[in-house]
């Protein structure tokens, strides 16, 4: 059974992940056209189901394309370079989902824009945090 300290650690990690994802989304929303227009033509894969920490596997698999898209934007809207930002997210995701169990991610048929993708994972974080508090 999870201890109160491990629950607290999970909550803090999720909050950190949530802030990172929100920072990316805010940065994207500050883009001028045609950068945003171009960005929105990139498609991301969405999880069929995202209700447990193990489902973060689906986010992990999309971090490389996410980094590429952020690199293309060459934005000054982020305090960190995309590589560092995504690296930070990757570390948190790996810790949260754990490496003991191998989970095969199932993706939805429909792809999503970067904005829809980020909003989906922001909602996921908020949902899990609410169950922990």
């Amino acid at each position: 059974a999870p201890t109160s300290s491990s629950t607290k650690k999970t909550q803090l990690q999720l909050e950190h992940l949530l802030l990172d994802l929100q920072m990316i989304l805010n940065g994207i929303n500050n883009y001028k056209n045609p950068k945003l227009t171009r960005m929105l033509t990139f498609k991301f894969y969405m999880p069929k189901k995202a209700t447990e920490l193990k489902h973060l596997q689906c986010l992990e698999e999309e971090l490389k394309p996410l980094e590429e898209v952020l690199n293309l934007a060459q934005s000054k809207n982020f305090h960190l370079r995309p590589r560092d930002l995504i690296s930070n997210i990757n570390v948190i995701v790996l810790e949260l989902k754990g490496s003991e169990t191998t989970f095969m991610c199932e993706y939805a048929d429909e792809t999503a824009t970067i904005v829809e993708f980020l909003n989906r994972w922001i909602t996921f974080c908020q949902s899990i945090i609410s169950t922990l508090t």
Epitope: P34, P65, L72
Partner: antibody, heavy 121, light 108 residues
Amino acid sequence: QVQLVESGGGLVKPGRSLRLSCAASGFTFNRYAMSWVRQAPGKGLEWVAMISFDGGNQYYTDSVSGRFTISRDNSKTTLFLQMDSLRTEDTAVYYCVRSPAGDWVAYFDYWGQGTLVTVSS
Amino acid sequence: DIQMTQSPSSLSASIGDRVTIPCQASEDISNHLSWYQQKPGKAPKPLIFDASDLETGVPSRFSGSGSGTDFALTISSLRPDDFATYYCHQYHDYPSYTFGHGTKLEIK
């Protein structure tokens, strides 16, 4: 790093066919629109064809429409250009190029080294 | 299709000169314009996109300006490596992308 390597060029007679390939590496190929751009000897650049990230949309310049077909195999990270009913005016170096977008509204940010297609009897 | 006019077709300049290469679109293309540098026997190299944004790794002596129909590529202080042919390219009239015919920058 991003690499685009073209192959399949050569000498071909008018009316014949040729298939160009472009092996892509160093990026998530299945997220990017790809194009072919050509350059006739001593001439300028001409965009030939473009394909969206998933192959769902293809676009062509008028002079090749109906004769050329652009396609991609995302599992093999390879772009193709099937060229049928070739004409002497199709003689050019053909470049495989990446666009920093999933579809349209995009310039070309990475270019292959090119492959020469010569159409002559 | 939108026509891209690059005039002159060739330009002579000396090392250290400030050079401006113009490009004109036949209709408004907003800032959907890019610039490429090409050397003989080589693939074009991207320099500028969205009219004024510098590609990663391109020296800051290169700059792009303009919007609508009139654009320019400026090299603030010519280096020996800059002698090449420069092409402008519009990606506004999707999907009918068109290039200018190029301006060859030669040593005076």
